[in-house]
């Protein structure tokens, strides 16, 4: 089975690597533009240079290409808590990330928000905070995990999943209540 190729991929596959087929003359293969540049004019003929121009400030191309325009630099999303790790250059897009002791939560493949790593108060760190994953906590006796925080078993209602973890405490409270009534 031959994988489905788009028109552009089909045209490019006719030429050797690093070249593309001239859009007006399919007998000519033009050299692609280096990263950091874009296609201003196709090569006039075989063996002649492609006219490539450097990307302007605020734009980039990260690989060899025959794009008519450079790509706009990404902006880090301040409202998502993102910070700029490295600024955009002609051959590399802006790199955005999170501050120290934060991790990325991806809402979609292209959108992440920064959240503070859990500190595991009233518990211990089972797995350290990673770039894309919060700390995994294990709670001390008398505490249960709720929304990745160790909460006192005194906040455990019988209907919640914490009842198994907090069963001894709940029984003790119940016992105390029972012994107090005559």
């Amino acid at each position: 089975l031959v994988p489905h190729l788009g028109d552009r991929e089909k045209r490019d596959s006719v030429c050797p690597q690093g070249k593309y087929i001239h859009p007006q003359n399919n007998s000519i293969c033009c050299t692609k533009c280096h990263k950091g540049t874009y296609l201003y004019n196709d090569c006039p003929g075989p063996g002649q240079d492609t006219d490539c121009r450097e990307c302007e400030s605020g734009s980039f191309t990260a690989s060899e290409n025959h794009l008519r325009h450079c790509l706009s630099c990404s902006k880090c999303r301040k409202e998502m808590g993102q910070v700029e790790i490295s600024s955009c250059t002609v051959d590399r897009d802006t790199v955005c990330g999170c501050r120290k002791n934060q991790y990325r939560h991806y809402w979609s493949e292209n959108l992440f928000q920064c959240f503070n790593c859990s500190l595991c108060l009233n518990g211990t760190v089972h797995l350290s905070c990673q770039e894309k994953q919060n700390t995994v906590c294990t709670c001390h006796a008398g505490f249960f995990l709720r929304e990745n925080e160790c909460v006192s078993c005194s906040n455990c209602k019988k209907s919640l999943e914490c009842t198994k973890l907090c069963l001894p405490q709940i029984e003790n409270v119940k016992g105390t209540e029972d012994s107090g009534t005559t």
């Epitope: 939560h105 809402w107 979609s108 493949e109 292209n110 959108l111 928000q113 959240f115 929304e147 990745n148």
Partner: nanobody, 120 residues
Framework: EVQLLESGGGLVQPGGSLRLSCAAS????????MAWVRQAPGKGLEWVSF????????YYADSVKGRFTISRDNSKNTLYLQMNSLRAEDTAVYYC?????????????WGQGTLVTVSS
Amino acid sequence: EVQLLESGGGLVQPGGSLRLSCAASGFTFSMYSMAWVRQAPGKGLEWVSFIDFDGLHTYYADSVKGRFTISRDNSKNTLYLQMNSLRAEDTAVYYCAKFSTSTMALFDYWGQGTLVTVSS
């Protein structure tokens, strides 16, 4: 067929409260992050709030922080938006949206919207 049906909009006085609901069907609701997005008259779309599949992560636009609360009930396949201390600038059509799994768009399904009017 994926369906998102918003309800709970209406006319409310400044300082008042409303609770929007979004009933979801046609997909496994508990596996997807959801969002509320609004469009004020003559303006573009604005992200209001997001919630992830299990409710552990939320996002709020600065304009609604501390006033709006997003929540979900996966057993009822329903998304909520509790809106308190409403202001005139909150007047908009509020849409419930499902996050997309593709890179092409942030959201792949939208509700028809519910109108919220804040006016005295």
